[in-house]
């Protein structure tokens, strides 16, 4: 029986050009975490296998950093990064647990400020 729960950062926002840490935590189970997969809608971002280490998809290699821990740091954010992210915990003997994070990437406050208060 699967007793664990995934805690995530939930809905988060960050500025364009900045970075964000995607983090999930599995609790209430003694199951062993064998692997964590990080996914965005229809593509893989990264995998952290407990034995084999990290795999990072080529589309994200330039702006994804492994960690901290089983989390993922997404850098050089663009508005296109807005959307759902999933952490998929592969565990033994429980099976798979999935957590969801919604990231909204906002235009930077500097850009907003500049757009609203232009010098004539």
């Amino acid at each position: 029986m699967m007793t664990g729960t995934i805690e995530t950062t939930g809905n988060i926002s960050a500025e364009k050009g900045g970075s964000i840490i995607l983090q999930c935590h599995l609790s209430s189970t003694t199951a062993q975490v064998t692997q964590v997969n990080w996914e965005q809608q229809d593509q893989l971002l990264a995998i952290c296998n407990a034995d084999l280490g990290w795999h990072i998809s080529p589309s994200f290699k330039d702006r994804v950093a492994p960690g901290p821990g089983l989390g993922l740091t997404l850098q050089s954010l663009t508005v296109n990064d807005t959307g759902e992210y999933f952490c998929i915990y592969h565990t033994y003997p429980d099976g798979t647990y999935t957590g969801r994070i919604f990231l909204e990437v906002l235009e930077s406050s500097v850009a907003e400020h500049g757009a609203r208060f232009q010098i004539p």
Partner: antibody, heavy 119, light 107 residues
Framework: QVQLVQSGAEVKKPGASVKLSCKAS????????IYWVRQAPGQGLEWIGG????????NFNENFKSRATLTVDKSSSTAYMELSRLRSDDTAVYFC????????????WGQGTTVTVSS | DIQMTQSPSSLSASVGDRVTITCKAS??????VAWYQQKPGKAPKLLIY???YRYTGVPSRFSGSGSGTDFTFTISSLQPEDIATYYC?????????FGGGTKLEIK
């Protein structure tokens, strides 16, 4: 350039063990996992397992977990696979492979070692 | 374990033909799929990964696509040197598994 050079062909009796080697060169050995894949005659590819040379951690296909041992010798940049309690259906070509940078895909391959198990 | 079902298992085509091979995963594998080419007596070679990136030095006639459970490998214009067996492989979760292979022959 990256090279994986494997040991020569082996002929073994059922029940025996075999230890294959894979000598790596052209890159920093501890920075990339080594994986082992086998191919029985006329058959497809089967993943056996992998080893992380930096810490010795291993991950196996359950079909091989009880019989396969993966080790590395960092000083000689060599990976080893030992397969025990050999059976006739272990007759195959055994390949060592290396991943891409931060990638699990098998970017580099050794030339293969033929293992024949026959009484 | 995740099964990778590759089809067809063999195919015959003419030089210049467009050739398509499909691979279906028994469960979701996101984009964690690679394609390999193997010629008789040789080690496999990585062609395509993740699942649309051509590996270094691979000609542009080779391409791949897909996500989730359905993946496609295409040779846009078959060349004589493309005669080989092609395998798909998933690395979404261990044990990593290969398709059964597609043997490509020239008509």
């Amino acid at each position: 350039q990256v090279q994986l050079v494997q040991s020569g062909a082996e002929v073994k009796k059922p029940g025996a063990s075999v230890k294959l080697s894979c000598k790596a060169s052209g890159y920093t050995f501890i920075s990339y996992n080594i994986y082992w894949v086998r191919q029985a005659p006329g058959q497809g590819l089967e993943w056996i397992g992998g080893v992380n040379p930096s810490n010795g951690n291993t991950n196996f296909n359950e079909n091989f977990k009880s019989r396969a041992t993966l080790t590395v010798d960092k000083s000689s940049s060599t990976a080893y696979m030992e397969l025990s309690r050999l059976r006739s259906d272990d007759t195959a070509v055994y390949f060592c492979t290396r991943g891409n940078y931060y990638g699990y895909e098998f970017a580099y391959w050794g030339q293969g070692t033929t293992v024949t198990v026959s009484s | 374990d995740i099964q990778m079902t590759q089809s067809p298992s063999s195919l015959s085509a003419s030089v210049g033909d467009r050739v398509t091979i499909t691979c279906k995963a028994s469960q979701h594998v996101s984009t964690a799929v690679a394609w390999y080419q193997q010629k008789p007596g040789k080690a496999p070679k990585l062609l395509i990964y993740s699942p649309s990136y051509r590996y270094t030095g691979v000609p542009s006639r080779f391409s791949g696509s897909g996500s989730g459970t359905d993946f496609t490998f295409t040779i846009s214009s078959l060349q004589p040197e493309d005669i080989a067996t092609y395998y798909c492989q998933q690395h979404y979760s261990t044990p990593w598994t290969f398709g059964g292979g597609t043997k490509l022959e020239i008509k």
